[in-house]
């Protein structure tokens, strides 16, 4: 039975040209995290494998940095970066947990962080 929950940074906003940290945290389970995949809508951004380390997709290599922890840092943000981001936790023996973050990249300097929320 899957008992874990993913806590994410929720709905967040950031300024164009700036950077943002995408973070997820898996709790309430003793399952072993074997890999975390970070995806933007339908594109793979990065993979963090427990044994193999980090792989940043070639399309994002120049502006995505691994970490902190299992999180991901997006740099040189553009308005096109607005959208949904997913952290996909592959665990043993539970299976897959998915967290969702919505990022809005703003032209102005009125970028505020949204509240944290949980996805079961």
């Amino acid at each position: 039975m899957m008992t874990g929950t993913i806590e994410t940074t929720g709905n967040i906003s950031a300024e164009k040209g700036g950077s943002i940290i995408l973070q997820c945290h898996l709790s309430s389970t003793t399952a072993q995290v074997t890999q975390v995949n970070w995806e933007q809508q339908d594109q793979l951004l990065a993979i963090c494998n427990a044994d193999l380390g980090w792989h940043i997709s070639p399309s994002f290599k120049d502006r995505v940095a691994p970490g902190p922890g299992l999180g991901l840092t997006l740099q040189s943000l553009t308005v096109n970066d607005t959208g949904e981001y997913f952290c996909i936790y592959h665990t043993y023996p539970d299976g897959t947990y998915t967290g969702r973050i919505f990022l809005e990249v703003l032209e102005s300097s009125v970028a505020e962080h949204g509240a944290r929320f949980q996805i079961p």
Partner: antibody, heavy 121, light 107 residues
């Protein structure tokens, strides 16, 4: 340039263990990367068997987990495959390969030439 | 495990033709698909990784693309040395899995 070379017995009897060696030249297996075993059955089906990393961590294909183990000899820059309780279904060409996860994800960029293994009494 | 299906075991082509080989993943693999070329008596060689990125030294007549869980490998103008078996492989999650292969033959 990195080179990998598989070696081992060409013929193994059913129920016995299969042991293969991969000798790596041109790169230290303890420096980086994951080192892979893959096999190709007659008829061309390819199966990923698992890896041993530069730090010695291992991961196995669950379909083989009860029968497979990877070890290494860092002084000889070799890594090994042992497969127990073999059957005729294990007849295949066995390849060792390198996985540069940082650059290519789980794609294998260097392969050995392969060694053919027949399981037969 | 993720199943990678190459629906054509054989494909016939002529030198100079454009040819496309397809591969379908049984579930979401995002852009994590590689393509290999294997000539008779040789080991597989990496051509494409991350769905569309050419490996070092691979000629630009080889391209890869993706639509959902469908992946396509294209040779824009087939050369004699391209006659081989081509495999797709998902590198999204272990155990990494391969398609059954597509053999490119001359008509």
């Amino acid at each position: 340039d990195v080179q990998l070379q598989e070696s081992g017995p060409g013929l193994v009897k059913p129920s016995q263990s299969l042991s293969l060696t991969c000798t790596v030249t041109g790169y230290s297996i303890t420096s980086d990367y994951a080192w892979i075993w893959i096999r190709q059955f007659p008829g061309n089906k390819v199966e990923w068997m698992g890896y041993i990393t530069s730090s010695g961590s291992t991961s196995y294909n669950p379909s083989l987990k009860s029968r497979i183990s990877f070890t290494r000899d860092t002084s000889k820059n070799q890594f090994f495959l042992q497969l127990t309780s073999v059957t005729t279904e294990d007849t295949a060409t066995y390849y060792c390969a390198r996985l540069d996860f940082g650059n290519y994800g789980g794609a294998m960029d260097y392969w050995g030439q392969g060694t053919s293994v027949t399981v037969s009494s | 495990d993720i199943v990678m299906t190459q629906s054509h075991k054989f494909m016939s082509t002529s030198i100079g033709d454009r040819v496309s080989i397809t591969c379908k993943a049984s579930q979401h693999v995002s852009t994590a698909v590689a393509w290999y070329q294997q000539k008779p008596g040789q080991s597989p060689k990496l051509l494409i990784y991350s769905a569309s990125y050419r490996y070092t030294g691979v000629p630009d007549r080889f391209t890869g693309s993706r639509s959902g869980t469908d992946f396509t490998f294209t040779i824009s103008s087939v050369q004699a040395e391209d006659l081989a078996v081509y495999y797709c492989q998902q590198h999204y999650i272990t155990p990494y899995t391969f398609g059954g292969g597509t053999k490119l033959e001359i008509k």
